[in-house]
């Protein structure tokens, strides 16, 4: 099988979304875990992560293969302590199994504003206050 | 056992919102699909949507779009959905349902009791 | 969307009778077909799960078969308490889908 993990983020007013999403088949789902972490270069886990998920078992309608799980952490308004490298991360807690995603940063300047770089998606999002650029 | 409760009954006026809940028990919340059903008096059943409650997706058919929102509390075991701007047309019993394990039983194999609501001026 | 039609709409029948009623695709969904009976005043509940396989606690009289877009669902010998409405109901694909239903009622 083949289990795939992408990182992607997406901005709401002031709010910032950061997306971990797995695609996977059904029968992989069984014991896998999405989570997220922030300035851990080695040792990520569902124990050091900021958020974690239980990778969807069923994509609710019985006619497709692959099944879509994401998760999200939602910073409502960005500062400085957000400042840091963030990687989405799965591990199987049954096979062992461990995937890891692109890292991906997030830098607050000091004029008030933010960047996200490192994402596949290319995105630029500018906020009049407290601005946010993703790219 | 696996239980649906429902609140209870609803009258509302045209131009309103209602928000429907259903506390589930009895199995892992997260882990399956919560389905909405309504059904208009002498009519029969419609799918207005389902959601997700491990991470909160959720799937509205385009005729309730805009208009059905879908919650679920995981910490309460409860989804919820709301629906706004009724309209007499909104008068029926709303159902939530969950889903079973696909490939196991895939059809809607439990049901809440079922919640009236009234649109009426 | 998947449009499920249910035929006939009404089946008028005598206790002893076999039931045989229809639920037809508007394209294929494979054996992505659950049927579910309805009573006045209750909520539906689970008959048969995809197409033909039995739901624990369902008597043995009901039963389904089909595949693709044509489905059939069959109650041997009607009993009483089976004069209701049925629907069937379709997981293929997103929206899922209700058919219309078919009552059985006594002759």
């Known amino acids: 099988g083949c289990i795939n993990i992408t990182s992607s983020a997406s901005q709401e007013g002031t709010r910032l979304n950061l997306i971990c999403t797995v695609w996977h088949k059904k029968e992989e789902a069984e014991g896998f875990v999405v989570f997220l972490c922030k300035d851990r270069s080695g040792d990520c886990s569902p124990e050091t992560s900021l958020k974690q998920l239980r990778l969807k078992r069923d994509p609710g309608i019985d006619g497709v293969g692959e099944i879509s799980s994401q998760l999200m952490f939602t910073i409502s308004q960005v500062t400085p302590l957000h400042s840091g490298t963030y990687q989405c991360c799965a591990r199987s807690q049954k096979s062992g199994i461990r995937l890891q995603g692109h890292f991906f940063s997030i830098l607050f300047t000091e004029t008030g504003n933010y960047t996200v770089t490192g994402l596949k998606q290319r995105q630029h999002l500018e906020f009049s206050h407290n601005e946010g650029t993703l790219s | 056992q696996v239980q649906l409760v429902q609140s209870g009954a609803e009258v509302k006026k045209p131009g309103a919102s209602v928000k429907v809940s259903c506390k589930a028990s009895?199995?892992?919340?997260?882990?399956?699909?919560m389905q909405w059903i309504r059904q208009a008096p002498g009519q029969g059943l419609e799918w207005i949507g389902a959601i997700y409650p491990g991470d909160d997706e959720a799937r509205v058919t385009q005729k309730f779009r805009g208009r059905a929102t879908l919650t679920a509390d995981k910490s309460t075991s409860t989804a919820y959905m709301e629906l706004s701007s009724l309209r007499s047309e909104d008068t029926a019993v709303y159902y939530c349902?969950?889903?079973?394990?696909?490939?196991?039983?895939?059809?809607?194999?439990?049901w809440g009791q079922g919640t009236t609501l009234t649109v009426s001026s | 969307e998947i449009v499920l039609t249910q035929s006939p709409a009404t089946l008028s029948l005598s206790p002893g009778e076999r039931a045989t009623l229809s639920c037809r695709a508007s394209q294929s969904i494979s054996n992505h077909l659950h049927w579910y009976q309805q009573k006045p005043g209750q909520a539906p509940r689970l008959l048969i799960k995809y197409a033909s396989q039995s739901i624990s606690g369902i008597p043995a009289r009901f039963s389904g078969s089909g595949s693709g877009t044509d489905f059939t669902l069959t109650i041997s010998s009607l009993e009483p308490e089976d004069f209701a409405v049925y629907f069937c109901?379709?997981?293929?694909?997103?929206?899922?889908?209700f058919g219309g239903g078919t009552k059985v009622e006594i002759k």
């Open positions: 349902a969950r889903r079973g394990i696909a490939a196991v039983v895939g059809g809607f194999d439990y």
């Open positions: 009895g199995y892992t919340f997260s882990e399956s699909w």
């Open positions: 109901q379709q997981s293929n694909s997103w929206p899922l889908t």
